[in-house]
Interface confidence: low
Amino acid sequence: EEELQVIQPDKSVLVAAGETATLRCTATSLIPVGPIQWFRGAGPGRELIYNQKEGHFPRVTTVSDLTKRNNMDFSIRIGNITPADAGTYYCVKFRKGSPDDVEFKSGAGTELSVRAKPSAPVVSGPAARATPQHTVSFTCESHGFSPRDITLKWFKNGNELSDFQTNVDPVGESVSYSIHSTAKVVLTREDVHSQVICEVAHVTLQGDPLRGTANLSETIRVPPTLEVTQQPVRAENQVNVTCQVRKFYPQRLQLTWLENGNVSRTETASTVTENKDGTYNWMSWLLVNVSAHRDDVKLTCQVEHDGQPAVSKSHDLKVSAHPKEQGSNTAAENTGSNERNIYHHHHHH
């Protein structure tokens, strides 16, 4: 009679994580008598998966009834597969011996590959805000997928980006893999409403990629432009001076009026108007009592935006003597100079 052969017909089996793997094994003969054992891996460090004779293997069930005398089907099912179960499984026939059974013949092995979905991509941007025309880096990470083949793409507002570097780790064989990608994105003034998207495609996703997003509103700082203008006289001896603060983001902004270099009022932008591009506008104004000044007044609008160094714009207010004031005595001039000379108002548009 021909010597017993152990046949594992499947060289490889591919199973999705969470499903059940069937590992097939048949023997060509009932002789010699002895049990079957299943191992993962070969050599001294191999891991016992199932022993027909003894032991408790809660995740393993046999396909056939191994207690029947004429059974030659030693296939098993392993439930709730995870990436950690990946490896090569060997069906090994033992010959009954004393005191221990002796290994007789092994099958060729079946490689179990586990398909595991990648985790939802997590996109993170720079720690500090940056201004338009700067390039910032975004990272995208996804973990726990198998097999290793994976595709990652970057988009900004639907437009595919090309300036990125991607690594899949580890380089060698592993039960599961991680992907890490860094993309460079050039900021523009219109990016307050922009999104950066990382898209991951994998065999387990069946054509429906996973996406991670980051809003550039958390990354961009658009510095304001300032314009100080003198409005027509509102009342006798009073001039209205406005400071227009335009196109800034985020909203955090503090404005200080300086009169000849001395702080006269500080206020925080509250009721702002939003532009279509997501940036903000704000306006502050002062009423200046020109009769209280003998000399020209330098009014400065100083703005500190989002904790950045202050920017400022100045306006020289020309003080010319009014006809009715001509010939006024020194005492009257002194009295005038003691009056509070700037009336502070702010107005939101």
């Epitope: 940056a130 201004t131 338009p132 025309q133 700067h134 390039t135 090309s162 300036d163 570097q165 460079k184 050039v186 900021l187 523009t188 003034r189 510095p223």
Partner: antibody, heavy 123, light 107 residues
Framework: QIQLVQSGSELKKPGASVKVSCRAG????????MNWVRQAPGQGLEWMGF????????TYAQGFKGRFVFSLDTSVSTAYLQIGSLKAEDTAVYYC????????????????WGQGTLVTVSS | DIQMTQSPSSLSASVGDRVTITCRAS??????LAWYQQKPGKAPKSLIY???YRYIGVPSRFSGSGSGTDFTLTISSLQPEDFATYYC?????????FGQGTKLEIK
């Protein structure tokens, strides 16, 4: 279509100054930084620096601080390079080149170039 | 400053040849490397950025590779219009620096 159009050749005497213009077309000037690159006769390319066209902030390479000034006139979508106190060794072709982006610490690749302006300094 | 060294300085080749130009940086520049082509009397033309990416309109016979300190520009099959001087440029660190150029001539 994107193009950078530079002003014509200049012949100057030593000690004079020159202003080279670079007009941006097909895109918004203030969306991309502008670089200036020098190429002396028969020599390679030398980066002079760039200007952040959004803030107007210039950055000069070490050998180009002092006599060289980058400026903008956004109303006519034009960047300028002005060179003062010209010397014979300033004779070169000067190129403006648009940066793909303005980088904090990693510079930028240039995607579009002007046609170049030859500045000749001779007595 | 980061020094960029190209080799060879000049190279003779024939139409249809495969040509490789190398560029070595004096320190790690990651993939922040660009390649430019310049013909006599003309402005440089941008070919490659981020070491490997071709600009739109650049023929596929041009390819870039490398990272860190060693980079390569390969022209898979030389065409008559490819005879020119080629420059590499690093943009990892200020000041931006160029290689000295490689002149590609007709054999």
């Amino acid at each position: 279509q994107i193009q950078l159009v530079q002003s014509g050749s200049e012949l100057k005497k030593p000690g004079a100054s020159v202003k080279v213009s670079c007009r941006a077309g097909g895109y918004t000037l203030t969306d991309y930084a502008m670089n200036w690159v020098r190429q002396a006769p028969g020599q390679g390319l030398e980066w002079m620096g760039f200007i952040n066209t959004y803030t107007g902030e210039p950055t000069y390479a070490q050998g180009f601080k002092g006599r060289f000034v980058f400026s903008l006139d956004t109303s006519v979508s034009t960047a300028y390079l002005q060179i003062g106190s010209l010397k014979a060794e300033d004779t070169a072709v000067y190129y403006c080149a648009r940066t793909r982006g303005y980088y904090d610490f990693d510079g930028g690749a240039f995607d579009y170039w002007g046609q170049g302006t030859l500045v000749t300094v001779s007595s | 400053d980061i020094q960029m060294t190209q080799s060879p300085s000049s190279l003779s080749a024939s139409v249809g040849d495969r040509v490789t130009i190398t560029c070595r940086a004096s320190q790690n520049v990651g993939t922040h490397l660009a390649w430019y082509q310049q013909k006599p009397g003309k402005a440089p033309k941008s070919l490659i950025y981020s070491a490997i990416y071709r600009y739109i309109g650049v023929p596929s016979r041009f390819s870039g590779s490398g990272s860190g300190t060693d980079f390569t520009l390969t022209i898979s099959s030389l065409q008559p219009e490819d005879f020119a001087t080629y420059y590499c440029q690093q943009y990892n660190t200020y000041p931006l620096t160029f290689g000295q150029g490689t002149k590609l001539e007709i054999k």
